[in-house]
Interface confidence: medium
């Protein structure tokens, strides 16, 4: 179903791009899911503008967002996570657009936390370990995680290294010496659920020693 | 109109296979989870097996699990069920059901005829 | 995996009569229960979704109530096309999964 206004307060509406995006969080707040959506064109006017989500919901045929400044946004158990739903913008009673979403397909995950940085001397290399929420989760525990690093000099140049685990290890020899480097992670579903990526963890920096300096465990900066 | 056409039962002999398919026509199949429900001759309704509408998510009865496959193709609106390793027990009118979970909970809303598969030697 | 338990396994009743039909889960399952009816040589027919909403075309006599672990259908006024047999259905999310119970077989009396 979609469609445009023609009531007087919107008779502009025909004018408007109400084109939108969305991710579900899962089991974000406990059982709790979280579905978070927003306009894709920052200057649509939002006065009055409502967004509804029907079917593929237990126990209720639809369920309203709650608008937060720019986004809107549910928190509820109440979805079904099989089948598609359907978003739509609305105005009053009014839909102006629909989208049919399978919630399971814009998953975005939790940003990884507790990154960290060892450097171990015998071996000659940096053990980079970092944690998920999502290991506890009873649905999106499968994750892809990529883990970008850089030389702090070099603004852009960001090497990544994609794994399925929580621990990294780099290669000394791969590294500049006596350097400062930024790490940070971020991960995505990998397994039945798809969507998009984390935020980025928050960024570890550490510093390499230099050649034959042996300078045991990476102190954070 | 919304209609479910199933095809492929027949008789066939323990341990063998055999692959069912329903046809779905006048709804967005790729819209829709489907699913495989039997009737053994005077018994009650047993589900077999589901499949959402992306395939990603299936789902197996315990008694049909590691035998049966199901699998789908969008493009050609169409649901099939692999039988291998067939047994008496598994002789029962087979019926592909759409889901319409809008409604709020999973409930099959179309059935089509059946199939009969009789499994005997 | 959750049971279904219906009761009784089959009753008899007169047109006119009002019959109530009782399925029990083995654990809750909020109102996540769907009403079916079968006539011999026909495939089953949705009239309850949600435990008591109606589906479309479905005659007002038939209802449904319960949630958690107990649910009925009742029927307020028996018609002579509703004999027939009665099932009560679940499901479960994730992973897919569907439980029917043994239903119940409405016979005329």
């Known amino acids: 179903e979609s469609g445009y206004a023609q009531n007087g307060d919107l008779e502009d509406a025909e004018l408007d791009d109400y084109s939108f995006s969305c991710y579900s969080q899962l089991e974000v707040n406990g059982s709790q899911h979280s579905l978070t959506c927003a306009f894709e064109d920052p200057d649509v006017n939002i006065t009055n503008l409502e967004f509804e989500i029907c079917g593929a919901l237990v126990e209720v045929k639809c369920l309203n967002f709650r608008k937060l400044q720019e986004i809107y946004f549910i928190e509820t158990k109440k979805f079904l996570l099989i089948g598609k739903s359907n978003i739509c913008v609305k105005v009053g009673e009014k839909s102006l657009t629909c989208k049919k979403i399978d919630l399971t397909t814009i998953v975005k995950p939790e940003a990884p936390f507790d990154l960290s940085v060892v450097y171990r001397e015998g071996a000659n290399d940096f053990v980079v370990t970092f944690n998920t929420s999502h290991l506890q989760k009873k649905y999106v525990k499968v994750l892809m995680h990529d883990v970008a690093y850089r030389q702090e000099k070099d603004e852009n140049k960001w090497t990544h290294v994609n794994l399925s685990s929580t621990k990294l290890t780099l290669l000394q020899r791969k590294l500049q010496p006596a350097a400062m480097y930024e790490i940070k992670v971020r991960s995505i579903p990998d397994h039945y659920f798809k969507g998009f990526w984390s935020e980025w963890s928050p960024s570890y920096y550490f510093r390499t020693p230099e050649i034959n300096n042996s300078s045991g465990e990476m102190d954070p900066i | 109109e919304v209609q479910l056409v199933e095809s492929g039962g027949g008789l066939v002999q323990p341990g063998r296979s055999l692959r069912l398919s329903c046809a779905a026509s006048?709804?967005?199949?790729?819209?829709?989870?489907m699913h495989w429900v039997r009737q053994a001759p005077g018994k009650g309704l047993e589900w077999v097996s589901g499949?959402?509408?992306?395939?990603?998510?299936?789902g197996y009865a315990d008694s049909v699990k590691g035998r049966f496959t199901i699998f789908r193709d969008n493009a050609k609106n169409s649901l099939y069920l692999q039988m291998n390793s067939l047994r008496a027990e598994d002789t029962a009118l087979y019926y592909c059901?759409?889901?319409?979970?809008?409604?709020?909970?999973?409930?099959?809303?179309?059935w089509g005829q059946g199939t009969t598969v009789t499994v005997s030697s | 995996a959750i049971q279904l338990t219906q009761s009784p396994s089959s009753l008899s009743a007169s047109v006119g009569d009002r019959v109530t039909i009782t399925c029990r889960a083995s654990?809750?399952?909020?109102?996540?229960l769907a009403w079916y009816q079968q006539k011999p040589g026909k495939a089953p027919k949705l009239l309850i979704y949600?435990?008591?909403s109606l589906e479309s075309g479905v005659p007002s006599r038939f209802s449904g109530s319960g949630s958690g672990t107990d649910f009925t259908l009742t029927i307020s006024s028996l018609q002579p096309e509703d004999f027939a047999t009665y099932y009560c259905?679940?499901?479960?999310?994730?992973?897919?999964?569907?439980?029917f119970g043994q239903g119940t077989r409405l016979e005329i009396k």
């Open positions: 059901a759409k889901d319409e979970y809008s409604r709020g909970y999973y409930v099959l809303d179309v």
């Open positions: 006048g709804f967005t199949f790729d819209d829709h989870a």
């Open positions: 499949i959402s509408w992306n395939s990603r998510g299936i």
């Open positions: 654990q809750g399952i909020s109102s996540a």
């Open positions: 949600d435990a008591s």
């Open positions: 259905q679940q499901f479960n999310s994730y992973p897919l999964w569907i439980t």
